[in-house]
Interface confidence: low
């Protein structure tokens, strides 16, 4: 975290030879330069007087499928590839005996990560040419010379963002399970600036260190049932495309503002990182949007504060906990970090001190709950499937792929006895082994709530007997009255809502005048109209970034940058008693509705947003005219 | 408006082969597929071939091995390579963009004025 260059060394070390155990086809004889790295791996090293065996399995998921690199060819020009099946060198696991033990290494050259032993975080590197077999350090990171690191975030900012900080809400939950819901997958971009790419001083050197750290972080968020897949790195070997500042809140702001001109032609993404080797001010190492994941300004600043990965990998990690609404842990009344005091603090610390934190407290873990419950976060449902993974399907990686009926992570990690992990088929005599309508291997019986009522627009989902997932989410009838609109797909879409999602918390509907126009290209207002579903008309707030705008007066429409295209009302708007915007005019409720469809539900259901039954508790679609479990036994099916 | 300018059809031998190529300008967002249909005389338009967002691809049975699809995310375009052409390949060949403005609105849809490929026994 030491602002100072070169990089601070180790204080204390132990030297050991690491030893790789023999495994079935592990291409030893093989020339190294044809890069051919085993899935599984297993290495034993005497550190610390114990001899700690380390089994490892290559992260399939570090990268996308459609991963791309930029950075520009030697006549200037910006060049964009898609490496092609590549092999790397980057695994993660365990420690052979210490049930919640992690390890994140590379054995690109020599073996260099961490890997973890109850509180103990430790760090290995080489210290020669000697490859695997060579001279390496294994060493803590509070030996590593350094200076504290803290976060930019204020607390200032974090406050309103956050709402209230009660000890109440971290209630922690019991053992050290896993959040029972499904895995969420960030799919990472990553810039690395000028500086850091002088300091390292070559692309392959910046691939490697880059590969290293969101190996890292990727495992640090497996224990929050997360994943970070890394769907593009651009390297700034030639120049920045914008000027870091040593001032991050500055930085930052560059940051995303270059993102959102860049998006149409570059990655789309959940989540953009910018790596800098410019010092920060002071001692902040980095520096986030709160609660912003998904959106445009979904983004952070990371200085490479250590010569070791992990230093910038646990930066990257807080950083990114903010872009998921976590605060930090001292600003929270009864926060629980479960980490041996001496040990060190966990990742949403202010400031780093002089150990890396190795996991999430109580309630970061909270926070990502209460974020994940939002609209705004469904960007990080989206598995990536097969296509996106490089190296086909992957018993253990977390995904249930082709030839699959559960997947609950490699053998040592997983806790799910209804899934044989090593052969990713159910264990015998089980049903199922993932689904909210699953539950101690057997399907749920019908009528169990999967998924409650989420606001006013929303309908409750209920297992139905046969399935382990609970059924697709359902909406309550477009045209059903809700907070100052209508519901529509499970929206309740209001003018003042709409100019709040693009200008922010400040953002109000224009006056009713505005809507009186529609505009042309070039800003210029055309002829009248006599409703509110043209252009969107804002008035307040702050200005998207990359957005340009239109003003007549005090109405304020976004358009795209040629100035040919308005953001719309959307479609389902209210635009007056028993009104709704409907293909771009205001029109009766009624186009919602082909028929009286509830009437068919024969009183044991409502009609849902597709005009279909959702049928209460117990009740067979599709007229909900019979009880489930008359239509099981007539169907003698089970699940 | 997206506008999807065809080019590279024309007339070839059986056996032969043809790159056609989609170039898609204007108010682009988020592609979520590109793909290549075709329709020959007194016949339904079909499917050919498709390509995703995350670079899967799906082709109709009959050009499978024959035919490949690709694109090029940075210049909005898609190809179509088509080899070992026989004459029921025949047809006009039209290019459709699938998008959405924003993550998960709704699908807008766009299509080429087509292009003609004939392949001549």
């Known amino acids: 975290i030491a602002p100072s260059r070169p990089w601070a060394l180790m204080e204390q070390y132990e030297v050991v030879l690491p030893w790789r155990l023999p495994g079935p086809r592990v291409r030893r004889a093989l020339p190294s330069h044809l890069g051919l790295h085993p899935e599984r791996v297993s290495y034993v090293l005497g550190a610390t007087g114990h001899n700690f065996t380390l089994h490892l399995r290559k992260n399939r998921d570090l990268l996308g499928s459609g991963y791309t690199e930029t950075y520009t060819a030697a006549n200037g020009s910006e060049v964009t590839e898609q490496p092609r099946g590549q092999d790397h060198c980057f695994y993660q696991g365990h420690v052979e005996g210490y049930p919640d033990s992690a390890a994140s290494l590379s054995t690109c050259a020599g073996l260099r990560g961490f890997f973890q032993v109850g509180s103990d975080l430790h760090l290995i590197e080489p210290l020669d040419e000697g490859g695997e077999g060579g001279r390496h350090a294994v060493y803590q990171a509070e030996h590593l010379l350094q200076t504290a690191g803290t976060c930019g975030v204020s607390d200032d900012s974090l406050g309103s963002l956050l709402g209230p900080r009660t000890a109440a809400v971290f209630r922690p939950r019991p053992g050290d399970s896993l959040p029972s819901r499904e895995t969420r997958y960030v799919e990472l971009y990553v810039v690395v600036d000028n500086a850091e790419f002088q300091m390292l001083g070559s692309e392959a050197a910046v691939r490697h260190r880059v590969l290293e750290v969101v190996n890292h972080v990727d495992k640090l968020y497996q224990k929050l049932n997360f994943r970070v897949v890394l769907v593009g790195l651009e390297i700034w070997n030639s120049q920045d495309r914008f000027h870091v500042s040593p001032d991050p809140s500055v930085t930052l702001e560059n940051l995303l503002t270059w993102q959102a001109r860049q998006r149409t032609r570059r990655h789309l993404h959940d989540n953009v990182q910018l790596i800098t080797g410019v010092d920060f001010t002071g001692t902040t190492v980095g520096f986030a949007r709160v609660s912003a994941m998904c959106s445009h300004s979904s983004g952070a600043v990371n200085q490479d504060h250590s010569k070791n990965p992990v230093g910038v990998a646990c930066t990257m990690a807080h950083e990114m906990g903010h872009n998921l609404g976590m605060d930090h842990d001292e600003n929270v009344q009864g926060c629980r970090c479960q980490e041996r005091f001496e040990a060190g603090r966990c990742i949403m610390a202010g400031s780093i001190g002089s150990s890396f934190p190795r996991m999430f407290s109580d309630c970061s873990q909270a926070y990502l709950e209460s974020f994940l419950e939002r609209p705004q976060s469904v960007c990080l449902a989206n598995a990536p499937d097969l296509s996106h993974l490089v190296g086909g399907p992957v018993c253990g990686n977390l995904f249930v792929e082709r030839g699959e009926q559960c997947d609950c992570g490699p053998p040592e990690d997983c806790r799910n006895r209804c899934c044989n992990s090593t052969t990713c088929q159910l264990a015998e005599g089980a049903q199922c082994a993932h689904g909210t309508c699953c539950q101690e291997c057997k399907v749920k019986p019908a009528g169990e709530l999967c998924r409650p009522k989420k606001d006013m627009c929303d309908l409750e989902e209920f297992c139905d007997g046969r399935h382990p997932e609970c059924p697709e989410d359902a909406f309550q009838e477009n045209g059903t009255p809700c907070s100052g609109g209508y519901c529509y797909n499970g929206a309740c879409p209001t003018l003042a809502q709409q100019c709040q999602a693009f200008w922010g918390p400040g953002g109000q509907a224009a006056e009713e005048s505005c809507f009186s126009y529609d505009i042309l290209p070039g800003c210029k207002a055309s002829r009248y109209r006599a409703d509110m579903c043209g252009v969107l008309q804002c008035k307040g707030g702050q200005q998207p970034l990359g957005r340009a705008i239109c003003i007549v007066d005090v109405c304020h429409a976004l358009t795209t940058e040629d100035g040919t295209a308005y953001e719309p009302v959307p479609e389902g708007t209210r635009c007056g008693p028993e009104k709704v915007c409907w293909k771009g005019r205001c029109q009766d409720l009624h186009v919602y509705r082909s028929s009286n469809c509830s009437a068919q539900c024969h009183n044991h259901g409502v009609c849902n947003h597709k005009q279909e039954c959702h049928c209460h508790a117990g009740w067979a679609p599709p007229h909900c005219a019979k009880l489930l479990t008359e239509v099981h036994a007539a169907s003698g099916s089970l699940p | 408006e997206v506008q999807l300018v065809e080019s590279g059809g024309g007339l070839v031998q059986a056996g032969g082969s043809l790159r056609l190529s989609c170039a898609a300008s204007g108010n682009i967002f988020r592609i979520e597929t590109m793909a290549w249909h075709r329709q020959a005389p007194g016949k339904q338009r079909e499917l050919v071939a498709a390509?995703?967002?995350?670079?899967?691809?799906n082709y109709l049975d009959f050009v499978k091995g024959r035919f490949t699809i690709s694109r090029d995310n940075f210049k909005n375009t898609v190809y179509l390579q088509m080899n070992s052409l026989k004459p029921e390949d025949t047809a006009v060949y039209y290019c459709n963009l699938i998008q959405r403005r924003a993550p998960y609105s709704r699908l807008e849809t766009y299509w080429g004025q087509g292009t003609q490929v004939t392949v001549s026994s």
């Open positions: 390509i995703r967002r995350d670079e899967m691809t």
